[in-house]
Interface confidence: low
């Protein structure tokens, strides 16, 4: 089964090659809207130094395999090379959100991207009713990514002094109220991203319409609107809307909950101070440590490494997990030196899968939580690749 492009087509996505000072605009179904790339460009690359933009992938020259999309062009790689054409290759992996296209590398001929997204999953378990892009680049080309805040079920309760109402929101997607562990959101209308509970009734006060926007280097904004349908009586004829402003704090701090800063005629303004609004390089590294210079905090997990010894064992319900944290690749898990996490099915010990690899390691410290992520594991039945936190 190929990638579900419909979910990605509604938006023009952005990726950045910061080393070469280039911005890519990506619309997997066609027009990225930049004139010099032409009307059928699916991937347009803009050189920030020269302000020149050129197409590196044409929507009319698209070919696809199950998890790979290739966009060719009619342009030769170099003036002297008329044989090979410039092309873009996007590898899709199943993810829990729409995700973001990540620039991997570029050669003279091929621009490579990787995209972990629900659009690539075999099963619909993570698919949202409505989801919008949840990241933005600042003018230093640093990525601000709120995808980790997206809830797959339920919502966030907004801190509000009104005892008669409770406002719940999700980030960049609708609230999946049916899968909410607490039953109170089950009454929320399907598709709402902002649900107001008043008495025993629930009102849809906003749905995601467009992606996350950057206001300044430390402020991001998301707007939910309710355009169709009848307006609740208490809105005094106004259409409900919710504006959520995410603020990167000026120094490291624990996480806070979203706070209602203003409301009038069903227009709700919410401010959320969260380190996820800061640029991603401030929050994470690909090693097992974070430094005071870059991350404003010093953390080193390398003492947890099991050099030459046995891995940590974690007992799950169906699986036993073997974990080699920040480890020495001489410790072979799943008979594979690349494996950082390995899972073995309890009912059948021959069923062994890599659940994360050393080369796909991310250490993240945000809102007081320290998370070590190993991705790039073997494929699951959902199409999802194993991914260990």
């Amino acid at each position: 089964q190929a990638v579900d492009l419909d979910a990605l087509c509604s938006y023009t996505w952005e990726a950045v090659d910061s080393k070469n000072n280039a911005v890519y605009k990506i619309n997997v179904c066609g027009n990225v809207g930049i004139s010099s790339c032409g009307p059928t460009s699916a991937i347009c690359m803009c050189d920030l130094k020269t302000e020149n933009c050129r197409s590196v992938g044409d929507s009319l020259l698209r070919s696809s395999a199950r998890s790979l999309l290739e966009f060719n062009t009619t342009m030769g790689c170099q003036p002297s090379d008329s044989q090979h054409r410039i092309q873009t290759s996007i590898t899709f992996l199943c993810g829990k959100t729409l995700g973001t296209p990540e620039f991997v590398t570029a050669t003279d001929c091929v621009h490579y991207f990787e995209w972990r997204t629900t659009a690539a999953c075999k099963k619909d378990i993570f698919k949202a009713d409505k989801e919008v892009p949840c990241y933005a680049f600042d003018d230093k080309l640093q990525k601000h990514d709120l995808n980790p805040l997206i809830k797959l079920n339920g919502g966030y309760l907004v801190d509000d002094s009104d005892p008669d109402t409770s406002l719940f929101i999700n980030v960049c997607r609708d609230i999946d109220s049916l899968r909410d562990p607490s039953t109170q959101l089950r009454v929320c209308p399907a598709g709402t991203a902002a649900c107001l509970l008043k008495g025993n009734q629930a009102f849809d006060v906003g749905r995601p319409k467009e992606g996350l926007k950057l206001l300044s280097k430390d402020r991001l904004v998301l707007t939910y609107v309710k355009e169709e349908g009848e307006k609740p009586d208490f809105c005094n004829g106004h259409s409900p809307a919710v504006t959520v402003t995410f603020v990167c704090p000026s120094e490291r701090r624990e996480g806070t909950i979203p706070k209602l800063t203003a409301k009038s005629n069903c227009r709700y303004e919410v401010e959320w101070i969260t380190e996820y609004a800061c640029h991603r390089d401030y929050l994470q590294s690909e090693s097992c440590s974070l430094s005071s210079e870059q991350h404003d905090i010093t953390i080193d997990l390398s003492p947890l490494a099991q050099y030459g010894g046995s891995p940590y064992v974690s007992d799950g319900r169906e699986y036993t997990f073997f974990i080699n944290v920040c480890g020495d690749t001489k410790v072979s898990l799943c008979n594979n030196k690349e494996a950082a996490v390995c899972q073995e099915k309890k009912a059948d010990s021959t069923q062994v899968k890599i659940a994360g690899r050393h080369q796909n390691q991310t250490l993240r410290y945000s809102d007081g939580d320290l998370t070590l992520i190993y991705s790039g594991g073997d494929e699951c039945s959902s199409g999802h690749h194993h991914h260990h936190h």
């Epitope: 952005e14 280039a22 911005v23 605009k25 930049i34 004139s35 010099s36 347009c44 803009c46 050189d47 920030l48 130094k49 020269t50 302000e51 020149n52 933009c53 680049f137 600042d138 003018d139 080309l141 950057l214 300044s216």
Partner: nanobody
């Protein structure tokens, strides 16, 4: 230092057209990226369109693609926004902006100079 002044706003019916102008004073206009933004009361200013210093490359937000055209005449130190098939949701104060640093027009933040704004109202 670049000073910007918008003109051409007004009240029109849905479906009508309007052309906004932005005149710049200062010798460097031909070297800088130009942009148009709009704002409705109670909302943040939002990006509409931008044009590179040469005028070769233009970029539009999704909601105006195919309806709005940005252009510039460097000899006259002027940038334009031709708005066709206007909708009530296009109502707002339109600002022209300019950016001296040579960043991509695809980046919609980081503008250094701003005009005072001109009101566009589209009635249904």
């Amino acid at each position: 230092q670049v000073q910007l002044q918008e003109s051409g706003g007004g009240l029109v019916q849905a479906g009508d057209s309007l052309k906004l102008s932005c005149t710049a004073s200062g010798p460097t206009f031909s070297e800088i990226t130009g942009g148009w933004f709009r704002q409705v009361p109670g909302k943040e200013r939002e990006f509409v369109a931008s044009i590179s210093s040469t005028g070769i490359t233009t970029y539009y937000t999704d909601s105006v693609k195919g309806r709005f055209t940005v252009s510039r005449d460097n000899a006259k130190n002027t940038m334009y926004l031709q708005m066709n098939s206007l909708k009530p949701e296009d109502t707002g104060v339109y600002y022209c902006a300019a950016r001296s640093t040579s960043r991509s027009i695809a980046i919609t933040v980081g503008y250094d100079y701003w005009g005072q704004g001109t009101q566009v109202t589209v009635s249904s």
